[in-house]
């Protein structure tokens, strides 16, 4: 129903704490360079204004839309043009164009330093002094680096952070309590970020229909006992929630997500037998839990899919009658039978089925034409299955770091024009798929691997869009989202690439590398590996291994030396010479 004051309505629904958190996230995602203090000031002003509207919905400006209120706040920031350049031009526009303009200026790769975690004692001190400010900083720092982070889920991660600090700061050994727990939250949050970015990309590039298809497949896998009408209702609601969050309407998004969680918990009987544990939790944990709830047990008596979609005489009539509903039913029926497939694969199969009906239903004898459609799915299913087997075998053989290196070589050969930092980031993320998915039971590997890879490759595409340098990448990123991963997998060495000149300084290292944390050391070595491949794109795996082993040995020797600087300056040039010879 319509409310006199939208801001009062959302404040009442969400409560002050969540309201403030969401407004802070919204501002941080729009203006990514502003400091925490600048945003905190704006948040307080918006909250005070919301309270006046709660007290009197007819008060001045309380009837304005949230976009108008928030946009006016952002546009009133001093030095907007100096700090944000052309983003300031958005302020000359009227709503809804102004908000669209802000959205277009969100930067997926802002030039901000990595979010460094303070050491345990310092963290606990500032947390104890002011937990609210501490958590505000967390929301601000994550949101500005991840401008499409799913806002209600970020509140959940902040809550997790809070609970970990409350527990660990009371312990004697704070460091060993905090580090693994916070690393766990960080890892989950980063995965959540790339997954949500993929959803927003789907919405932005292909519209609500594409996202809804994704939701139907995903929900049908998780809730195979729910009927099509129930799945459609959930998919429609979920699409609305995600559209709002991707569009910067974070208060509406969080409010509607809470409503959806409430609906699911009130209708467990028609949705799934697995929801009760989630439904017993408080709001943020409940919604998070529902989003990753285990699949319900599949009904035992499901008829073969062919009955309704191949053998039924009415296939073309049903398709003609309501194309989207018929294809939606196909996607639902196929997905609920295949929790072992990735959503991307299910969508590819639905697309293949649609193309087959488009072709066959126009023929004089459609049944003879579409009768083999299910057999034609086989190569589409085999391709990702082989991908999973090959990559998991390689991961098990090499371990995470070695697996990342293998991917780095592969992707540098596919797209050597891409910047080395982007290639290293992509390979490290792609390589984590091994640890994340290859240890899972067989029937969970494919959905885990392919949907995770798709999300990471979406980020590669977003970064490449800013500065397009590789025709290979442009080709794969231009197609539909579900075809991207197979497209990247099929890429081979880019024959058009002119190898980079060998520059000794690229492979010159200093003793400061010895004190770097292990992760930073790995990144330095992987940067060198990518540069080697750019120098010799057709180097064999053996050649590259020889060079990298030599490099590792060099680092180990010099970092253990009494006079590290001398070791680096004398042994370094020898290493460079040996590298050149090995790759000659």
């Amino acid at each position: 129903e319509a409310h006199k004051s939208e801001i009062a309505h959302r404040y009442n629904d969400l409560g002050e704490q969540h309201f403030k958190g969401l407004v802070l996230i919204a501002f941080s995602q729009y203006l990514q360079k502003c400091s925490y203090d600048e945003h905190a000031k704006l948040v307080q002003e918006v909250t005070d204004f919301a309270k006046t509207c709660v007290a009197d919905e007819s008060a001045a400006n309380c009837d304005k839309s949230l976009h108008t209120l928030f946009g006016d706040k952002l546009c009133a920031i001093p030095n907007l043009r100096e700090n944000y350049g052309e983003l300031a031009d958005c302020c000359t526009k009227q709503e809804p164009e102004r908000n669209e303009c802000f959205l277009q200026h969100k930067d997926d790769n802002p030039s901000l330093p990595p979010f460094e975690r303070p050491e345990a004692e310092a963290m606990c001190t500032s947390f104890k002094e002011n937990p609210t400010t501490f958590m505000g900083h967390y929301l601000h720092e994550v949101a500005r680096r991840h401008p499409y982070f799913y806002a209600p889920e970020l509140l959940y991660y902040a809550e997790q952070y809070n609970e970990i600090l409350t527990q660990c700061c009371a312990e004697a050994d704070k460091e060993s309590c905090l580090t693994p727990k916070l690393d766990g939250v960080k890892e989950k949050a980063l995965v959540s970020s790339v997954r949500q970015r993929m959803k927003c990309s789907s919405m932005q590039k292909f519209g609500e229909r594409a996202f809804k298809a994704w939701a139907v497949a995903r929900l049908s896998q998780t809730f195979p006992n729910a009927d099509f009408a129930e799945i459609t209702k959930l998919a429609t609601d979920l699409t609305k929630v995600n559209k709002e969050c991707c569009h910067g309407d974070l208060l509406e998004c969080a409010d509607d997500r809470a409503e959806l969680a409430k609906y699911m918990c009130e209708n467990q009987a028609t949705i799934s037998s697995k929801l009760q544990t989630c439904c017993d939790k408080p709001l943020l944990k409940k919604a998070h839990c529902l989003s990753e709830v285990e699949h319900d047990t599949m009904p035992a008596d499901l008829p073969a899919i062919a009955a309704d979609f191949v053998e039924d005489q009415e296939v073309c009539k049903n398709y003609a009658e309501a194309k989207d509903v018929f294809l939606g039913t196909f996607l639902y029926e196929y997905s609920r039978r295949h929790p072992d497939y990735s959503v991307s694969l299910l969508l590819r199969l639905a697309k293949k089925y649609e193309a087959t009906l488009e072709k066959c239903c126009a023929e004089a004898n459609p049944p003879a034409c579409y009768g083999t459609v299910l057999a034609e799915f086989q190569p589409l299913v085999e391709e990702p299955k082989n991908l999973v087997k090959t990559n998991c075998d390689l991961y098990e053989k090499l371990g995470e770091y070695g697996f990342q290196n293998a991917i780095l070589v592969r992707y540098t050969q596919k797209a050597p024009q891409v910047s080395t930092p982007t290639l290293v980031e992509a390979a490290r993320n792609l390589g984590r798929v091994g640890t994340k998915c290859c240890t899972l039971p067989e029937d969970q590997r494919l959905p885990c691997v392919e949907d995770y890879l798709s999300a990471i490759l979406n980020r590669v595409c977003l970064l490449h869009e800013k500065t397009p340098v590789s025709e290979h990448v442009t080709k794969c990123c231009s197609g539909s989202l579900v075809e991207r991963r197979p497209c990247f997998s099929a890429l081979t060495v880019d024959e058009t690439y002119v190898p980079k000149e060998f520059k000794a300084e690229t492979f010159t290292f200093h003793s400061d590398i010895c004190t770097l944390p292990e992760k930073e050391k790995q990144i330095k070595k992987q940067t060198a590996l990518a540069e080697l491949v750019k120098h010799k794109p057709k180097a064999t795996a053996e050649q590259l291994k020889t060079v990298m082993d030599d490099f590792a040995q060099f680092l180990d020797t010099c970092c253990k030396a009494a006079d590290k600087d001398t070791c680096f300056s004398t042994e370094g040039p020898n290493l460079v010479t040996r590298c050149k010879d090995a790759l000659a």
Partner: nanobody
Framework: KVQLVESGGGLVQPGGSLRLSCAAS????????MSWVRQAPGKGPEWVSS????????LYADSVKGRFTISRDNSKNTLYLQMNSLRPEDTAVYYC????????SSQGTLVTVSS
């Protein structure tokens, strides 16, 4: 909603001719192959003829080959069946269907061949 309305049936003497029409609405007519199906009193449905969406391909049951001609006008969303040299055994209710289906979802038009 898909709608198919047949017309043109009637009483005709053996050896005579009739032209049946089927007006289609509620779907993209030119994207779908269409068929004529008939059902004689007390019998099951029998496929008569089919035509592709573009009209370039046609198929006929052996019992009507050389006597019946199926055609379509996509600009008018209409399917036709020209029936020549009619025989008593052609007596049936004729239905048009989408995509080779034998199920009737319309009223049909009655063709009676009798002297």
């Amino acid at each position: 909603k898909v709608q198919l309305v047949e017309s043109g049936g009637g009483l005709v003497q053996p050896g005579g001719s009739l032209r049946l029409s089927c007006a289609a609405s509620g779907f993209t007519f030119s994207s779908f192959g269409m068929s004529w199906v008939r059902q004689a009193p007390g019998k099951g449905p029998e496929w008569v003829s089919s035509i592709s969406g573009s009209g370039s391909d046609t198929l006929y049951a052996d019992s009507v080959k050389g006597r019946f001609t199926i055609s379509r006008d996509n600009s008018k969303n209409t399917l036709y069946l020209q029936m020549n040299s009619l025989r008593p055994e052609d007596t049936a209710v004729y239905y048009c269907t989408i995509g080779g289906s034998l199920k009737q979802s319309s009223q049909g038009t009655l063709v009676t061949v009798s002297s």
